[in-house]
């Protein structure tokens, strides 16, 4: 079934499904998925020239 | 360890079937999508289809719709690829991979971050 | 459908050089794009997702950048290993579409 556009920002979705506490919707599928916790920057040390590349945890299975 | 194993593939004249299978380990497909993606010889990526195996819920692309089924045993942890009615055009390595989602606001922040080793399928007379 | 156009198709670098690729897509896709490095007969590997989150065990030389529709993977120091094939694909609406991709091969 196709099904159109949506944003990150559900500008256009109608607003997600609540979700499971480890669960969060996936707007490319329209359903509570699996989901990971996103890693902020650590901060460099002083000095250093350019910010840590974000990471990210593994996902919970 | 999270793993993908595709199956199934193989040589088919056109106009003929084969069934792709997708065997999973280390993770519980029913919490993800899975999808498949296929590459031609020398070509870039295709997205094929994709499932939510805890609902069934699907997708496929305009090149393959009403030709090509996505389905899912979550009690074996396998997804599968129905082809039918193939074309020369099909000739592809075919893998399958996991979305996997990321929590940004409560939603999902997502790619596919597990592929399997690809089959090859070989549509010729 | 979005269209995702990736230039340039190839390049020739040196290591160390610092490569930089970008991708356009044909409409607003806000953060949902992720780059895939792949080598020849081997399945494509996440590098970075939602636009800039550098996947688990990727090298912190590679980096993304961008929204809406431009978008950039950069190398900042590439090494023998990296010569590949990156593509970028969208995830904002389905079909999730690829770039043609972009290979990088040595000088």
């Known amino acids: 079934m196709r099904r159109g556009p949506r944003s990150l920002r559900g500008r256009d979705a109608p607003a997600p499904t609540p979700c499971v506490p480890a669960e969060c919707f996936d707007l490319l599928v329209r359903h509570c998925v699996a989901c990971g916790l996103l890693r902020t920057p650590r901060p460099k040390p002083a000095g250093a020239s350019s910010p840590a590349p974000r990471t990210a945890l593994q996902p919970q299975e | 360890e999270v793993q993908l194993v595709e199956s199934g593939g193989g040589l088919v004249q056109p106009g003929g079937s084969l069934r792709l299978s997708c065997a999973a380990s280390?993770?519980?497909?029913?919490?993800?999508?899975i999808h498949w993606v296929r590459q031609a010889p020398g070509k870039g990526l295709e997205w094929v289809a994709w499932?939510?195996?805890?609902?069934?819920?699907?997708d496929y692309a305009d090149s393959v719709k009403g030709r090509f089924t996505i389905s899912a045993d979550t009690s074996k942890n396998t997804a599968y690829l129905q082809m039918n009615s193939l074309r020369a055009e099909d000739t592809a390595v075919y893998y399958c991979?996991?979305?996997?989602?990321?929590?940004?606001?409560?939603?999902?922040?997502?790619?596919?971050?597990?592929w399997g080793q690809g089959t090859l399928v070989t549509v010729s007379s | 459908d979005i269209q995702m156009t990736q230039s340039p198709s190839s390049l020739s670098a040196s290591v160390g050089d610092r490569v930089t690729i970008t991708c356009r897509a044909s409409?607003?896709?806000?953060?949902?794009v992720a780059w895939y490095q792949q080598k020849p007969g081997k399945a494509p590997k996440l590098l970075i997702y939602?636009?800039?989150f550098l996947y688990s065990g990727v090298p912190s030389r590679f980096s993304g950048s961008g929204s809406g529709t431009d978008f950039t993977l950069t190398i900042s120091s590439l090494q023998p290993e990296d010569f590949a094939t990156y593509y970028c694909?969208?995830?904002?609406?389905?079909?999730?579409?690829f770039g043609q991709g972009t290979k990088v091969e040595i000088k």
């Open positions: 499932i939510t195996p805890s609902d069934g819920n699907t």
């Open positions: 409409q607003d896709v806000s953060t949902a």
């Open positions: 694909q969208q995830s904002y609406s389905t079909p999730p579409t």
């Open positions: 991979a996991r979305r996997v989602c990321y929590d940004r606001a409560r939603v999902c922040a997502g790619a596919m971050d597990y």
């Open positions: 939602s636009a800039s």
């Open positions: 280390g993770f519980t497909i029913s919490s993800n999508s």
